[in-house]
Interface confidence: medium
Amino acid sequence: AESCTSRPHITVVEGEPFYLKHCSCSLAHEIETTTKSWYKSSGSQEHVELNPRSSSRIALHDCVLEFWPVELNDTGSYFFQMKNYTQKWKLNVIRRNKHSCFTERQVTSKIVEVKKFFQITCENSYYQTLVNSTSLYKNCKKLLLENNKNPTIKKNAEFEDQGYYSCVHFLHHNGKLFNITKTFNITIVEDRSNIVPVLLGPKLNHVAVELGKNVRLNCSALLNEEDVIYWMFGEENGSDPNIHEEKEMRIMTPEGKWHASKVLRIENIGESNLNVLYNCTVASTGGTDTKSFILVRKADMADIPGHVFTR
């Protein structure tokens, strides 16, 4: 069974079959005797009850109000009323683009990564029994596919697959031919698989400093766009007015990843800044990586092996 029309605001294209289905349909069957009414209001007209005599284009079936087809003057608010249940929709009927096989405002955009599975299936469950044939067009050129009832594309995406795909269902109703168009704008993008973010350089860095001077600790990482890089130091970040985090700088790599660098600036170095850990962390959905800096007085350099120093 086709699901009910739950969206309160709907945009449709003139000249196509269209329907509204209220969302208490199962309930409506249980209370067959209850009065069920459909109303329309637009502009000056307030709550005009709809019935097949209102227009030859309107049909009422159980839970559904059908338009054969919907036209520009059908724009307005629609109400379904049954006992103490009311449902309202705002319908906006837009002009068909007569110079194209689809109307730009009624396009669904999809992004597909190259080499990933790409599928388009032309289906319309509500009108399924009335559909004579269905055609699939790419950029308004008909694709020759085997199945003319439910044409389908299933493949691994290539960049050439990018374009506008239109499913056009042809159906008969009361001796007239109608068509319903559903268009997808398919964009093929580079593989966006994530890397494991990595901090550059050794995990532990001893930095030789002089009291009263300034030092800049540079933390660099290769990471994904969504990953974050931050500094942690002391018991409470921000408690030392001499410590400043500089702006984070990111450079985009040709592969679409980011080279990030965040500097911690320590001004007027004091005893309290020595021999404590200044940690830089990169965090991603896949976990974290941390590197540490320790400030050491230049006079104490002799106590530490040379290979652990950064200058």
């Epitope: 992004i111 766009e225 969504e226 702006k247 984070e248 700088m249 990111r250 985009m252 679409g256």
Partner: nanobody, 126 residues
Framework: DVQLQESGGGLVQAGGSLRLSCAAS????????MGWFRQAPGKDREFVAG????????YYRDSVKGRFTISRDNAKNTVWLQMNDLKPEDTAVYYC???????????????????WGQGTQVTVSS
């Protein structure tokens, strides 16, 4: 109505400088990450630089690193792109754009930006 209005483009000799401005109105500017993109004739629109809503993180494409600087002033609802040492390959229409995410990163993908300016032409002659 949301408006992003770029200015500051023009014709400049190689090695010269330009400062592009983007004045925003009709949106809570400090809630949006901002980006600059450019589009040269016959080419796709490409990311140039971006800045988070607070200005705490900045982003550049590799080819403009060290030459271009992005900055913003939330009180003035403005974002700037200072372009130094311009090269002929920097010739393009430059667009200012606002990204939907308040917290998080400005994005290099133009599809993630919800508001766009009309663009300003930058021409660098050799």
């Amino acid at each position: 109505d949301v408006q992003l209005q770029e200015s500051g483009g023009g014709l400049v000799q190689a090695g010269g400088s330009l400062r592009l401005s983007c004045a925003a109105s009709g949106l809570p500017f400090s809630s949006y990450a901002m980006g600059w993109f450019r589009q040269a004739p016959g080419k796709d629109r490409e990311f140039v630089a971006g800045i988070t809503w607070s200005g705490s993180s900045i982003y550049y494409r590799d080819s403009v690193k060290g030459r271009f600087t992005i900055s913003r002033d939330n009180a003035k609802n403005t974002v700037w792109l200072q372009m130094n040492d311009l090269k002929p390959e920097d010739t393009a229409v430059y667009y200012c754009a606002a990204a939907r995410r308040r917290v998080g990163l400005p994005l290099a993908d133009p599809r993630e930006y919800v508001y766009w300016g009309q663009g300003t032409q930058v021409t660098v002659s050799s």
